[in-house]
């Protein structure tokens, strides 16, 4: 299971698609900017065994997939780009699930670092709450799109650290 290689490629494709999804100029939404307090420490590969890194990455992508699979999201984005982006996320989820089965050493270690998983979930709860408070406005979605690009970049960095561990 060459997780770091396949996942980084998938992540890059997802980032490109998410970049293409932008509909309005970020400069017109400067007043809507918000600090979602991304849990950066959860993307520090040094503190994780590979199994736990896999589950944190999966959590990140699953929560992103959940966010972009809502009816409100469907109304906000161009459908074919949204579908391609979602398909890319789904493929990454499948790859990560398969890695748990294939990766030597994952079996012996716990998959869960509960604090890390909860930190990622709370981060996405803050994003969802922001969208609700801003009534899913175009600028709110633009701010969220930029934030998810940032979080996907962090997850790519975690991948690179994992590759160095290999």
């Amino acid at each position: 299971c060459d997780l770091p290689q396949t996942h980084s490629l998938g992540n890059r494709r997802a980032l490109i698609l998410l970049g293409q999804m932008g509909r309005i100029s970020p400069f017109s939404c400067l007043k809507d900017r918000h600090d979602f307090r991304i849990p950066q420490e959860e993307f520090d590969g040094n503190q994780f065994q590979k199994a736990q890194a896999i589950s944190v990455l999966h959590e990140m992508i699953q929560q992103t997939f959940n966010l972009f699979s809502t009816e409100d999201s469907s109304a906000a984005w161009e459908q074919s780009l949204l579908e391609k982006f979602s398909t890319e996320l789904y493929q990454q989820l499948n790859d990560l699930e398969a890695c748990v089965i294939q990766e030597v050493g994952v079996e012996e270690t716990p998959l869960m670092n509960e604090d890390s998983i909860l930190a990622v979930r709370k981060y996405f709860q803050r994003i969802t709450l922001y969208l609700i408070e801003r009534k899913y406005s175009p600028c709110a979605w633009e701010v969220v799109r930029a934030e998810i690009m940032r979080s996907l970049s962090f997850s790519t960095n975690l991948q690179k650290r994992l590759r160095r561990k290999d």
């Epitope: 589950s55 944190v56 959590e59 929560q63 997939f65 789904y90 499948n94 699930e97 089965i101 509960e114």
Partner: antibody, heavy 126, light 110 residues
Framework: EVQLLESGAEVKRPGSSVRVSCRAS????????ISWVRQAPGQGLEWMGR????????NYAQNFRGRITITADKSPLTAYLELSSLRFEDTAVYYC???????????????????WGQGSLVTVSS | EIVLTQSPGTLSLSPGEGATLSCRAS???????LTWYQQKPGQSPRLLIY???SRATGVPDRFSGGGSGTDFTLTISRLEPEDFAVFYC???????????FGQGTKVEIK
Amino acid sequence: EVQLLESGAEVKRPGSSVRVSCRASGDTFSSYPISWVRQAPGQGLEWMGRILPALGVTNYAQNFRGRITITADKSPLTAYLELSSLRFEDTAVYYCASPSADIIPSILGTTLFAFWGQGSLVTVSS
Amino acid sequence: EIVLTQSPGTLSLSPGEGATLSCRASQNVSRHYLTWYQQKPGQSPRLLIYGGSSRATGVPDRFSGGGSGTDFTLTISRLEPEDFAVFYCQSYHSPPPVYTFGQGTKVEIK
């Protein structure tokens, strides 16, 4: 909490088709798969296939390929099972089942069935 | 394709006794992807244990799961009257996604 409500019992002739529906309510996500699992009278559980409603992606068990079709609507979140060329041995209770978004970590969520419908009895009889 | 074989087929025990149910896989299964369910007559299955050993919400601590590789166990430390049912193990494999059930073990009152 997710509630899954299936359509009522059906009696079908051999060779015909049946369509069973499963409506999800509560804390539902179209980004988690909905599966169909059947149980013949006095027998064990058998996974038939699943659908990811967000994308319409399906996966079918080898045993059913060629005569099973699973579809879904996203709003209201509903999954459908269609089984064709029915045989007497298809007489069973058909359950829809889904994972839980609350399972920690989420990587385990799609590997299990946390929520089950009440079951829909399909009887194949001449 | 993975085959899960549960044993024994039937277990006759009295309330208060302990029970150990076995689930053997035809090839290695990730313990993270091994799940146990309980099913009572006329009811839908209920999630008991996931990830090999994590109890689902509301499941009493008398239920525990263990094992790895090809051999897994569900242990009930002290049987309560409401525990008598059929128990199924289930594995997940990907890609493509495949869910496999064991044939079940019936725990009945002696």
